[in-house]
Interface confidence: low
């Protein structure tokens, strides 16, 4: 018996061929011997089966001795043995219809689980293998689960259902809702304007929700909410903002925040959360601000940084075009009685300069100038 696999919602064509290459009498019946369709001369006739409005044939092929049964908008319950009667012969075809669906929604938050459920006809024992967009293969039976979805899981999942050495493939588009970056760090000199950007890693027609930026300043004992906002159809509107600092927020995506001045008291870490309408859970992005200040007080030239620096970052003070006078894995360095000239304070990681501040030291009788 020939086995044909079909996909729920698709169209399948079951073939039936006579030895004579001409139009002759044929009938298609199901396993209960109920007629589905057949011919009366050149006319298509239909029986009382449940397939009535979804069954068809190709009259253009009858003259060649081909009498296909076409079933549209397949349903799991269409799985059956179909019998073609032609020339006193019976051709049997077993049709097995499968469906594969994602649990609830195909738009899932980063970290959530994806469950794919296979609908299959009674008596079948299919195996399923799905390949994620990042090349991961997941195997299972009636259900497949992937926990802790990551950004790279966004895209087309290709699932192969195997039954009786036959295969049918499904394609499911999954969108993982996340920020493009889990974390970012901004390095600024004291007094500079700070731009924080929170680009999303997905695009949807309408995006509605609400968000908040909580900030833990290095110098503060507790965190505080710097800004809350609403998002409606990709339009941003600020609900509440602190007076110090007074953040500004862009009205369009990507989410964009401006801090007018980088000051030591603002250095620290923030957590932007975004709750999307009709989704449980929130999107998160961490943002860090490191602020540098170079000062000269009497005979002491000091360079300081505030904020979340890693222990391997190096802070250096050097006179322009000369070797560093002092380099330490510390958050403050200083030089006593500095020579006159342009001094540079450098924050670097493995030789790469992340932040630089210049301060001009004048001969001892004059006042320092900060360019």
């Amino acid at each position: 018996k020939k086995v044909v696999l079909g996909k729920k919602g698709d169209t399948v064509e079951l073939t039936c061929t006579a030895s004579q290459k001409k139009s002759i009498q044929f009938h298609w019946k199901n396993s209960n011997q109920i007629k589905i369709l057949g011919n009366q001369g050149s006319f298509l006739t239909k029986g009382p089966s449940k397939l009535n409005d979804r069954a068809d044939s190709r009259r253009s092929l009858w003259d060649q001795g081909n009498f296909p049964l076409i079933i549209k908008n397949l349903k799991i319950e269409d799985s059956d043995t179909y019998i073609c009667e032609v020339e006193d012969q019976k051709e049997e075809v077993q049709l097995l219809v499968f469906g594969l669906t994602a649990n609830s929604d195909t738009h899932l938050l980063q970290g959530q689980s994806l469950t794919l459920t296979l609908e299959s006809p009674p008596g079948s024992s299919p195996s399923v293998q799905c390949r994620s967009p990042r090349g991961k293969n997941i195997q299972g039976g009636k259900t497949l689960s992937v926990s802790q979805l990551e950004l790279q899981d966004s895209g087309t999942w290709t699932c192969t259902v195997l039954q009786n050495q036959k295969k049918v493939e499904f394609k499911i588009d999954i969108v993982v809702l996340a920020f493009q970056k889990a974390s970012s760090i901004v390095y600024k000199k004291e007094g500079e304007q700070v731009e924080f950007s929170f680009p999303l890693a997905f695009t949807v027609e309408k995006l509605t929700g609400s968000g908040e930026l909580w900030w833990q300043a290095e110098r503060a004992s507790s965190s505080k909410s710097w800004i809350t906002f609403d998002l409606k159809n990709k339009e941003v509107s600020v609900k509440r903002v602190t007076q110090d600092p007074k953040l500004q927020m862009g009205k369009k995506l990507p989410l964009h925040l401006t801090l007018p001045q980088a000051l030591p008291q603002y250095a620290g870490s923030g957590n932007l959360t975004l709750a999307l309408e009709a989704k449980t859970g929130k999107l998160h992005q961490e943002v860090n601000l490191v602020v540098m200040r170079a000062t000269q007080l009497q005979k002491n030239l000091t360079c300081e940084v505030w904020g979340p620096t890693s222990p391997k970052l190096m802070l250096s003070l050097k006179l322009e075009n000369k070797e560093a006078k002092v380099s330490k894995r510390e958050k403050a360095v200083w030089v006593l009685n500095p020579e006159a000239g342009m001094w540079q304070c450098l924050l670097s990681d493995s030789g790469q300069v992340l932040l630089e501040s210049n301060i001009k030291v004048l001969p001892t009788w004059s006042t320092p100038v900060q360019p």
Epitope: Q129, R131, P133, R134, G135, K136, N137, E150, Q152, T156, T158, T160, E169, K171
Partner: antibody, heavy 118, light 111 residues
């Protein structure tokens, strides 16, 4: 940049076992499958199997099911392959290869030469 | 398992001419709009190098002289024009389903 650093050459006696390593760097180790490929001298490439480092899930070519064992250590971003009950047929260069996106091994280790000799 | 059969096993081409290598799969390696067939170049003593991924996509850093085409069961790697540096063995590989498989390889020489 992505790098796969394999352990050095192995000389083993018939019946013994060897365990070779492949240390990954330059990417998120748990996000991609790691494959192993065999090449006997003057012969073609033969796929052995892969491991998903995030779960430890493995798939082997049937003929290597009782021969090769793949493991992964997430803390050191290293994949291991152990070959058991060695025979002269196991003398070959073994490569690890990272699968990227939806197909193709864009990154390969330099290979580990295994010589089985009495 | 999907069996990949390359042809020819070896070929000699004059410099500046076109080389065509074929690979036939025992069953379709297509999955909707993707063909999971890849091509590699290997020189003696070196690991293979990915040239073409998913039938027709040129890997970054590979010269545009290399191109790939085909779908379902029949695939072709074309090198045009051939240069002296192209002397190597070329392999096709499918990753449509487990177990992944390689073709036997085609050795390219210069006439």
């Amino acid at each position: 940049q992505v790098q796969l650093q394999q352990s050095g050459a192995e000389l083993a006696k018939p019946g013994a076992s060897v365990k070779m390593s492949c240390k990954a760097s330059g990417y998120t180790f748990t996000n991609y499958l790691m494959h192993w490929v065999k090449q006997r001298p003057g012969q073609g490439l033969e796929w052995i199997g892969y491991i998903d480092p995030s779960t430890g899930y493995t798939v082997y070519l049937q003929k290597f099911k009782d021969k090769a064992t793949l493991t992964a250590d997430k803390s050191s971003s290293t994949t291991y392959m152990q070959l058991s009950s060695l025979t002269s047929e196991d003398s070959a260069v073994y490569y690890c290869a990272k699968e990227g996106g939806i197909g193709g091994f864009a990154y390969w280790g330099q290979g580990t030469l295994v010589t089985v000799s009495a | 398992d999907i069996v990949l059969t390359p042809s020819p096993a070896s070929l000699a081409v004059s410099l500046g001419q076109r080389a065509t290598i074929s690979c036939r799969a025992s069953e379709s390696v297509d999955s909707y709009d993707n063909s999971f067939m890849h091509w590699y170049q290997q020189k003696p003593g070196q690991p293979p190098k990915l040239l073409i991924y998913r039938a027709s996509n040129l890997e970054s850093g590979i010269p545009a002289r290399f191109s790939g085409s085909g779908s379902r069961t029949d695939f072709t790697l074309t090198i045009d024009p051939v240069e002296a540096d192209d002397v190597a063995t070329y392999y096709c590989q499918q990753s449509k389903e487990d177990p992944y498989t390689f073709g036997g390889g085609t050795k390219l020489e210069i006439k």
